[in-house]
């Protein structure tokens, strides 16, 4: 006996109670592929979640986080509290970065400032809680007799750098 369910398109389900007739998904449910025997319940964006895309008969709802939170996990499965730049989230809430570390985002952890001298560079601008150090020229470039000429043009142009 031919399986009539394979003819049921997305947005419908194969209703065994009605001789394998394709029935539309009920409200607040969806089927994203054809041939489904059931429709899936739509995700509800509640609490710290807000709706980014409404559920339709063929696709699930998509959630974002409300202001002050950011998404974590696949398909924004969790919301985590934002902190300010210069802070990181701990079990006790947002804490300022320790001296010598920075965080330039509202999420993530504080990272150590770059150690310019390890890379053979001098410090141009000191780091802050919100920003990494900017390294400057190498000490060799600063010695007497060093050329002040700009280095030769790079092989390819760099990408955009934050300002």
């Amino acid at each position: 006996l031919q399986d009539l369910c394979s003819n049921c398109p997305a947005g419908t389900f194969c209703d065994n109670n009605r001789s394998q007739i394709c029935s539309p998904c009920p409200p607040n449910s969806f089927s994203s592929a054809g041939g489904q025997r059931t429709c899936d319940i739509c995700r509800q964006c509640k609490g710290v979640f807000k709706t980014r895309k409404e559920c339709s008969s063929t696709s699930n709802a998509e959630c974002d986080c409300i202001s002050g939170y950011h998404c974590l996990g696949a398909e924004c499965s969790m919301c985590e509290q934002d902190c300010k730049q210069g802070q990181e989230l701990t079990k006790k809430g947002c804490k300022d970065c320790c001296f010598g570390t920075f965080n330039d985002q509202k999420r993530g952890i504080c990272r150590p400032w770059t150690n310019c001298s390890l890379d053979g560079k001098s410090v141009l601008v000191n780091g802050t809680k919100e920003r990494d150090v900017v390294c400057g020229p190498s000490p060799a470039d600063l010695s007497p007799g060093a050329s002040s000429a700009t280095p030769p043009a790079p092989a390819r142009e760099p990408g955009h750098s934050p300002q």
Epitope: V125, V134, G136, E157, P158, H160, S161, P162, Q163
Partner: nanobody, 125 residues
Amino acid sequence: QVQLVESGGGVVQPGRSLRLSCAASGSTFSIVAMGWYRQAPGKQRELVASIITGDGDTNYADSVKGRFTISRDNSKNTMYLQMNSLKPEDTAVYYCYARTGYGSSWLMGHEYDYWGQGTQVTVSS
């Protein structure tokens, strides 16, 4: 590429003021910080003052704190060094410097340091 051109140097008496300018052109969008270095004859080039182009945060060498002020006008792609109460020991060639990227290295390992050609400042009575 970034091009830097300094101007405003000259001969001035002790206690007087000068303002240096550094005009940047080319890929100025990539500059995250700029600075003024100076080099007296036979001496190492030293950092005088530096500035973050985005938020305007500044650093100064101890020897110029309270006398020199670094600033920038992003709309004109120009950095300035206002030098007040000049002393004979401020005599040097002053160089403009620009850096593209935080830390020491940049995207895909590119690193870029840019220098101007320098402008002479002589403080003498």
